[in-house]
């Protein structure tokens, strides 16, 4: 259900957590790549 139709507050919380975790992983990967390239 990646379209995020659900409005249940627990589902909303889990979606927020998932996005946070994903962004942290992506940003962390980019940071590591930048350090490596230096």
């Amino acid at each position: 259900h990646s379209d995020g139709i659900f409005t249940d507050s627990y589902s909303r919380y889990r979606k927020q957590m998932a996005v946070k975790k994903y962004l942290a992983a992506v940003l962390g990967k980019r940071y590591k790549q930048r350090v490596k390239n230096k």
């Epitope: 259900h1 990646s2 589902s11 979606k15």
Partner: antibody
Framework: SVEESGGRLVTPGTPLTLTCTVS????????MSWVRQAPGKGLEYIGI??????TWYASWVKGRFTISKTSSTTVDLKMTSLTTEDTATYFC?????????????????WGQGTLVTVSS | ALVMTQTPSSVSAAVGGTVTINCLAS??????LAWYQQKPGQPPKLLIY???TLASGVSSRFKGSGSGTQFTLTISGVECADAATYYC????????????FGGGTEVVVK
């Protein structure tokens, strides 16, 4: 692992607190849930506590039960106004991780359960 | 309210046969469904999540299918060890809901 404790025989109206003790993972990383099962019956969801200590409950709970974290490794289920209908095995279960394309919740790791008997 | 209805409540199967269990959601839950196996005196064990993904260590004889409101658990090549009660569970909502679990299906192996 997940282990429940505190189940015993109580009389109607007596409050009771069950404890779920986890090991091998952190409560700061996983949401936890309580589920119960009356003798010979199906599974019944009670509620969930997340890593931020926010809680969600089944509609039937109506404030009688409260889930809280009491330490970095324990989750309590406080039960009040108990009736014979609350006689059940109470399970503590770890909730699945959330992912961007799958943020549904599932019960991935269960304890053996603790039996609560409410009888006069 | 979102209600999960499981059928049949009990089913009998011969060793080597196939068992089909159905789960109906009262509203669209996309693929947010899990299946659990519970043997007497034991806690439930997660078999399948995201409607069709096998949990770690689960035999490929178990197959989950469906999406939206209709879901199926199929057990092929039934073994004596498959005798248990099976539950479906919607994973779409947990706030002020009735029960995310279906009523259960008892599988008896002959």
């Amino acid at each position: 692992s997940v282990e429940e404790s505190g189940g015993r025989l109580v009389t109607p109206g007596t409050p009771l607190t069950l404890t779920c003790t986890v090991s091998g993972f952190s409560l700061s990383s996983y949401d936890m849930s309580w589920v119960r099962q009356a003798p010979g019956k199906g599974l019944e969801y009670i509620g969930i506590i997340n890593t931020n200590d926010d809680t969600w409950y089944a509609s039937w709970v109506k404030g009688r039960f409260t889930i809280s974290k009491t330490s970095s490794t324990t989750v309590d289920l406080k039960m009040t106004s108990l009736t014979t209908e609350d006689t059940a095995t109470y399970f503590c279960a770890r909730i699945s991780d959330a992912y961007v394309f799958d943020y549904a919740y599932y019960f991935t790791l269960w304890g053996q359960g603790t039996l609560v008997t409410v009888s006069s | 309210a979102l209600v999960m209805t499981q059928t049949p409540s009990s089913v009998s199967a011969a060793v080597g046969g196939t068992v089909t269990i159905n789960c109906l959601a009262s509203q669209n839950i996309y693929n947010s469904l899990a299946w659990y196996q519970q043997k007497p005196g034991q806690p439930p064990k997660l078999l399948i999540y995201r409607a069709s993904t096998l949990a770690s260590g689960v035999s490929s004889r178990f197959k989950g299918s469906g999406s939206g409101t209709q879901f199926t658990l199929t057990i092929s090549g039934v073994e004596c060890a498959d005798a248990a009660t099976y539950y479906c569970q919607q994973g779409a909502g947990a706030d002020n809901i009735g029960n995310p679990f279906g009523g259960g299906t008892e599988v008896v192996v002959k």
